[in-house]
């Protein structure tokens, strides 16, 4: 009898109620391998999920996140809200990075500007909420009388926005 079940192809299941005949998977279910005794329920892409690939009798549906969200986890099992560059996501929504910190992604958290002086360098371009500082030559490398046009960036300490 086991041999009968092993003959059931993907897209079917071995129906014990019908003398182990191979029956097609019911609507909204699938079996991706042969010899299955049940079909699996199709994944539904709803809420913050949208359908990338419809379910078929032999393969599960695949989901993406709707616009304004990004995928996390295997097979996009989770969706997390996007923010703008220069922000981070908190429970109260997207918040601007604190002064001295930046985020160049639509996801993730703000992190401190690089402290150029720790490497003996000076600040060539100021940091913003969206971009890290750009470090230039060390002050000693500058021509006589020249000095850094901007003050050194704050030390790399974590920001303090509420999460």
């Amino acid at each position: 009898l086991q041999d009968l079940c092993s003959n059931c192809p993907a897209g079917t299941f071995c129906d014990n109620n019908r003398s182990q005949i191979c029956s097609p998977c019911p609507p909204n279910s699938f079996s991706s391998a042969g010899g299955q005794r049940t079909c699996d329920i199709c994944r539904q892409c709803k809420g913050v999920f949208k359908t990338r690939k419809e379910c078929s009798s032999t393969s599960n549906a695949e989901c993406d996140c709707i616009s304004g969200y990004h995928c996390l986890g295997a097979e996009c099992s989770m969706c997390e809200q996007d923010c703008k560059q220069g922000q981070e996501l908190t429970k109260k929504g997207c918040k601007d990075c604190c002064f001295g910190t930046f985020n160049d992604q639509k996801r993730g958290i703000c992190r401190p500007w690089t402290n150029c002086s720790l490497d003996g360098k000076s600040v060539l371009v100021n940091g913003t909420k969206e971009r890290d500082v750009v470090c230039g030559p060390s002050p000693a490398d500058l021509s006589p009388g020249a000095s850094s046009a901007t003050p050194p960036a704050p030390a790399r300490e974590p920001g303090h926005s509420p999460q």
């Epitope: 992604q105 992190r111 999460q163």
Partner: antibody, heavy 116, light 109 residues
Framework: QVQLVQSGAEVKKPGESLKISCKGS????????ISWVRQMPGKGLEWMGK????????NYSPSFQGQVTISADKSISTAYLQWSSLKASDTAMYYC?????????WGQGTLVTVSS | DIELTQPPSVSVAPGQTARISCSGD??????AHWYQQKPGQAPVVVIY???NRPSGIPERFSGSNSGNTATLTISGTQAEDEADYYC???????????FGGGTKLTVLG
Amino acid sequence: QVQLVQSGAEVKKPGESLKISCKGSGYSFSTYWISWVRQMPGKGLEWMGKIYPGDSYTNYSPSFQGQVTISADKSISTAYLQWSSLKASDTAMYYCARGYGIFDYWGQGTLVTVSS
Amino acid sequence: DIELTQPPSVSVAPGQTARISCSGDNIGDQYAHWYQQKPGQAPVVVIYQDKNRPSGIPERFSGSNSGNTATLTISGTQAEDEADYYCATYTGFGSLAVFGGGTKLTVLG
């Protein structure tokens, strides 16, 4: 598909140094935080610290500050956890995980045993 | 540092509802996440951002979070739910993540 693959189990003596690794694949390694999590035998999960591989910015749990060093080499999509002088109390399973709050992918863990 | 406190163990009969609490000062101001860990395996997210369930996690898992307590609820608990459960949160103050001490869920019978 996204994977975090950790280096193999280590057996060390007290006072020795050690560096374990976590190699990411299947995603933009530089732009996602990597956290390290300790689990001592029969105990719970403890967050140790994290690194942003894009610029190697790190921050540590106060409990682990100065005890370990977290680093990364984005050119080979690998994060590291290292000790300069191991203690018997460092015996534990160490996991790397992607993320800073929601840890959506985990390595298989590296078992570190420190015994004289 | 925020500290998260969980009961060390919770027991439940099959088919009954299990509730696992996670207490911490004003944890409701931050997102709480829940992880399930079975012996010899890495943890898996079962609830994220207080109440969201990843796809592939059964509908019997749910979460809530307000005030000083986050709660993981498993309705109609099954034998396969026996595992260790950890709450976790991330706080922007110091940019730290923290796990609760963990709760061993035993499904009786």
